[in-house]
């Protein structure tokens, strides 16, 4: 058993049929010694008396809010949550496996630049009685500070018969050094509580590996005289790290016909303009990627050829 | 050229070669993103290789103030990686494919380090500890980790030279 926060405790249980469970001793936080009784949740049934209560925690029916009273007055509470371990593996029932980039990916994170700011998100089908708490650090043995906000519900989607809820959190490294080569990964830890079930999820990454620039901005076409060619120009996204002479991007320019089956013409360039042939009903798209480190490409910015 | 007296390197040549190094490092190991090294244990390997750190003066302001600190740091790292790529981790069994970019990568590391410090100029004697012997089954993972770290190292070096070529070239 360990304390998650004040008056909230997590009991770690090996979860299998007829498991013996864990013996837990609760102590009433009071100077009083006599006349103390214990109840669980809303029930008025007295579970025991005295300053301590010993219980055998085996299942969710044994978890909940234990309250000690004296003469009708509440003295203190202890909320017991369960953390299940099945076949040596902690349960992951609350969050959905996003399976990208690999199986057992529950948390996904992205950064728009090298400033030390990043966003993580996760999915669940649970809509109520759900809380999340997020902590992060750079490195684990001698951790350096990363500050995370509160997790918020950021999207709701219908998937078949199910509703899916996306939660996200923004974090900022306290003393980020954008130009340095990271040697210690960022660690993100999410505590999830659904009713009386506790679970924790972790992710470990370097900012450089989760970089995904915003799409290029101000995408414009300039027809070239007496030609089917156009000059496409664009700018670095506002959110990208500066100076651009140091934090450089490379770009992919694509000409795509109306039909998905039509051949795509692609040009790669380090410049912020390119000359391409604009076909009728086609569109021109540009995306960006760090020039020197192959992290994710941005989403496409597009304009129609017409 | 970045010589101990403090004169400038051939920024544009360094930029071109460092960008080539980035390409080679990724072609030598394009799928690194699909393997989580931290699951493999042995964080010592990533602790053992050079890193360009915050105080090394490789940020835009540090380069403007005095690029020598950063260039020396990059030079040290290039020599270090060049020695690793020339060691039996890469030359021993299992043999690399004949068309593997590792050979080119090795030569380019040497080329860039020589651009930074031509013959006759010495920042310091380059020291590298004796490598632990490795078995064939360990080498694949070691190669993977070294190339993964090298990708991050040369990315910073390439940014430095690109910025230098754009803002510090005579």
């Amino acid at each position: 058993i360990w304390e998650l926060k004040k008056d909230v405790y997590v009991v770690e249980l090996d979860w299998y049929p007829d498991a013996p469970g864990e013996m837990v001793v609760l102590t009433c936080d009071t100077p009083e010694e006599d006349g103390i009784t214990w109840t669980l949740d809303q029930s008025s049934e007295v579970l025991g008396s005295g300053k301590t209560l010993t219980i055998q925690v085996k299942e969710f029916g044994d978890a909940g809010q234990y309250t000690c009273h004296k003469g009708g007055e509440v003295l203190s509470h202890s909320l017991l949550l369960l953390h299940k371990k099945e076949d040596g593996i902690w349960s992951t029932d609350i969050l959905k496996d996003q399976k990208e980039p690999k199986n057992k990916t529950f948390l996904r994170c992205e950064a728009k630049n090298y400033s030390g700011r990043f966003t993580c998100w996760w999915l669940t089908t649970i809509s109520t009685d759900l809380t999340f708490s997020v902590k992060s650090s750079r490195g684990s043995s001698d951790p350096q500070g990363v500050t995370c906000g509160a997790a918020t519900l950021s999207a709701e989607r219908v998937r078949g018969d199910n509703k899916e809820y996306e939660y996200s959190v923004e974090c900022q490294e306290d003393s980020a050094c954008p130009a340095a080569e990271e040697s210690l990964p960022i660690e993100v830890m999410v505590d999830a509580v659904h009713k009386l079930k506790y679970e924790n999820y972790t992710s470990s990454f370097f900012i450089r590996d989760i970089i995904k620039p915003d799409p290029p901005k101000n995408l414009q076409l300039k027809p070239l005289k007496n030609s089917r060619q156009v000059e496409v120009s664009w700018e670095y996204p506002d959110t990208w790290s500066t100076p651009h002479s140091y934090f450089s991007l490379t770009f992919c320019v694509q000409v795509q016909g109306k039909s998905k089956r039509e051949k795509k013409d692609r040009v790669f360039t380090d410049k912020t303009s390119a000359t391409v042939i604009c076909r009728k009903n086609a569109s021109i798209s540009v995306r960006a990627q760090d020039r020197y480190y192959s992290s994710s490409w941005s989403e496409w910015a597009s304009v129609p050829c017409s | 050229r970045a010589v101990p007296g403090g004169s400038s390197p051939a920024w544009t040549q360094c930029q071109q070669l460092s960008q080539k190094l980035c390409t080679l490092a990724w072609s030598a190991h394009p799928l690194v993103g699909h393997m989580d090294l931290r699951e493999e244990g042995d964080e010592e390997t990533t602790n053992d290789v050079p890193h360009i750190q915050c105080g090394d003066g490789c940020d835009p302001q540090g380069l403007r103030d005095n690029s020598q600190f950063c260039l020396q740091r990059i030079h040290q790292g290039l020599i270090f990686y060049e020695k690793l790529l020339g060691s039996d981790i890469f030359t021993g069994e299992p043999s690399l494919l004949p068309d593997s970019p590792v050979g080119q990568l090795h030569a380019s590391l040497l080329g860039l380090s020589q651009l930074l410090q031509p013959e006759g100029h010495h920042w310091e004697t380059q020291q590298i500890p004796s490598l632990s012997p490795s078995q064939p089954w360990q080498r694949l993972l070691l190669r993977f980790k070294i190339l993964r770290s090298l990708q991050a190292f040369v990315a910073v070096a390439a940014r430095v030279f690109a910025h230098g070529a754009a803002t510090l070239s005579p």
Epitope: - | V49, I79, F80, Q127, S130, S132
Partner: antibody, heavy 120, light 113 residues
Framework: EVQLQQWGAGLLKPSETLSLTCAVY????????VHWIRQPPGKGLEWIGV???????DYNSVLKSRVTISRDTSKNQFSLKLSSVTAADTAVYYC??????????????WGQGTLVTVSS | EIVLTQSPATLSLSPGERATLSCKPS????????????LAWYQQKPGQAPRLLIY???TRQSGIPDRFSGSGSGTDFTLTISRLEPEDFAVYYC?????????FGGGTKVEIK
């Protein structure tokens, strides 16, 4: 919890073979290099040899002709044999480990030591 | 092989005093690439195995009191005990692991004056 526990014969006659075994707990012999080190009474420490994570060995050149270090990864044990001992081999013998990395490491955990006396 | 010379051989001090121990290798232990010095310090008490105090010349092993500190680089290293406690009287060894064979210094005995 990381532990190295060693045992073996404590009293030998000259020309016999010293044989010691070290059992390791809390880590694996394919993740850590393991070593033998000795200390003659009232003297300093002397490195004897290492068995690397991959199973290969290296020995102190002074002792090379007489030393064999081997391991049994299934039992998580490794052994030292030193042949043709003389009174100069009287020492406390320690097993120790170092973390496998690109380069040789420092010894972070040690066995309790075994005093081996060579006397006729 | 790399030879480590420790000095002094014996240091006689009283509890509460500062102890400064020196270790000089015959060649540099600094890896210029990763800026690590491949030197460790150990404490040994009679009848006990050596105990790791400091690694990479200046990093304190977990659980070691902060009165122990390591400094130096290349070919000159120092172990400092800022205020000697009664339990600090022992023999101290330096170890190099830059090249194998691993080699130890001859030791410095810190004794009660």
């Amino acid at each position: 919890e990381v532990q190295l526990q060693q045992w073996g014969a404590g009293l030998l006659k000259p020309s016999e073979t010293l044989s010691l075994t070290c059992a390791v707990y809390g880590f694996s012999l394919i993740s850590y290099n393991v070593h033998w080190i000795r200390q003659p009474p009232g003297k300093g420490l002397e490195w004897i040899g290492v068995i690397w994570t991959g199973g290969s060995t290296d020995y102190n050149s002074v002792l090379k002709s007489r030393v064999t270090i081997s391991r049994d990864t299934s039992k998580n044990q490794f052994s030292l044999k030193l042949s043709s001992v003389t009174a100069a081999d009287t020492a406390v013998y320690y097993c120790a480990r170092d973390k496998y990395g690109l380069f040789p490491g420092y010894f972070d955990y040690w066995g309790q030591g075994t005093l081996v006396t060579v006397s006729s | 092989e790399i030879v480590l010379t420790q000095s002094p051989a014996t240091l006689s001090l009283s509890p509460g005093e500062r102890a400064t121990l020196s270790c000089k290798p015959s060649q540099s232990l600094l890896s210029s690439g990763n800026r690590k010095n491949y030197l460790a310090w150990y404490q040994q008490k009679p009848g006990q195995a050596p105990r790791l105090l400091i690694y990479y010349a200046s990093t304190r092993q977990s659980g070691i009191p902060d009165r122990f500190s390591g400094s130096g680089s290349g070919t000159d290293f120092t172990l400092t005990i800022s205020r000697l406690e009664p339990e600090d009287f022992a023999v101290y060894y330096c170890l190099q692991h830059f090249n194998y064979p691993w080699t130890f210094g001859g030791g410095t005995k810190v004794e009660i004056k």
